[in-house]
Interface confidence: low
């Protein structure tokens, strides 16, 4: 079992951006995290990017005022990831 | 319409250098991971390596880690992947594609043969 | 040898419907979801059928859907027509890095 985040939270919001913040998981296997945007209902990420495992923060750019994003966070190992923990925000 | 062009393939000698390119259009360009697939002729699918919107993170498959860069010119709507030290094995079509977790769009590819 | 294990050939009749399958190792690779399918035609790019594992882009016929049920996605053509024979690709996530399954060759008989 790939250890899921439990602590995303949004820090940072403006019309245009949305700050990432969680705390990184203490284990060797980890090799990082993948951050994941949808805009909500459309099902097809708009955007994805990959951070290392010491990594905590993210700041996701270039976003639509008005709308709102399902943003998940995945933790990677080599050869398998976990489910995604995903929170909505409007900008 | 969303529109991917490489170029750049041809026939190089084992240890020579090429350098793909792939002309994007009709979509922000700047907005969206892209990345470099192969395949051998008569096998399957390989991925190579994968860029970031901005272009500040790269990945590579290990069969071209140190050898092949990946990067792009948001301005120029162009990716590129520059191989260096071509060994016979790398002979394959190249494609450029959308996105990295899936790939939604696809050049049409462009042929690299490694032989002496 | 690929991470994602797909049967090296299928094939049907006019008509019928096939599925073919891709199998991951128990590592969690199909754990977010990723799961997508690719057509290609010989001499021709992939072409995206399905994604995320069971969404459809535009323009792609709704013969063909998806499934995933634990560690095996399956791809589901009903209505086979000759245009569908081709090969036939999956791919998910391994880690950081898209991995491919071997690829299905789709014969349509008759």
């Known amino acids: 079992e790939v250890p899921q985040l439990t602590d995303l939270s949004f820090v940072d919001i403006t019309d245009s951006s949305i700050g990432l913040r969680w705390t990184p998981l203490n284990s060797s296997t980890i090799i990082g995290y993948r951050i994941t945007v949808v805009a909500a209902g459309e099902g097809i990420p708009i955007f994805e990017d990959f951070v290392d495992s010491s990594v905590g923060y993210y700041t996701v750019t270039g976003l639509e005022p008005g709308i709102d994003y399902d943003i998940s966070v995945i933790t990677l190992i080599n050869g398998g990831e976990s489910a995604p923990t995903t929170l909505t925000q409007q900008t | 319409e969303v529109q991917l062009l490489e170029s750049g393939g041809g026939l190089v000698q084992p240890g020579g250098s090429l350098r793909l390119s792939c002309a994007a259009s009709g979509f922000t360009f700047s907005s969206y991971a892209m990345s470099w697939v192969r395949q051998a002729p008569g096998k399957g699918l390989e991925w190579v390596s994968r860029?970031?919107?901005?272009?500040?993170?790269?990945y590579y498959a290990d069969s071209v880690k140190g050898r092949f860069t990946i990067s792009r010119d948001n301005s120029k709507n162009t990716l590129y992947l520059q191989m260096n030290s071509l060994r016979a094995e790398d002979t394959a079509v190249y494609y450029c594609?959308?996105?990295?977790?899936?790939?939604?769009?696809w050049g049409q590819g462009t042929l690299v043969t490694v032989s002496s | 040898q690929s991470a994602l294990t797909q049967p090296a050939s299928v094939s049907g009749s006019p008509g019928q419907s096939i599925t073919i399958s891709c199998s991951g190792d128990?590592?969690?690779?199909?754990?977010?979801?990723?799961v997508s399918w690719y057509q290609q035609h010989p001499g021709k790019a992939p072409k995206l059928m399905i994604y995320?594992?069971?969404s459809r882009p535009s323009g792609v016929s709704n013969r063909f859907s998806g499934s995933k049920s634990g560690n095996t996605a399956s791809l589901t053509i009903s209505g086979l027509q000759a245009e569908d024979e081709a090969d036939y690709y999956c791919q998910s996530w391994d880690g950081r890095q898209p991995v491919f399954g071997g690829g299905t060759k789709l014969t349509v008989l008759g």
């Open positions: 995320l594992p069971t």
């Open positions: 860029i970031s919107p901005s272009g500040s993170s790269t």
């Open positions: 128990s590592l969690g690779i199909f754990r977010s979801g990723m």
């Open positions: 594609a959308r996105r990295m977790s899936y790939f939604d769009y």
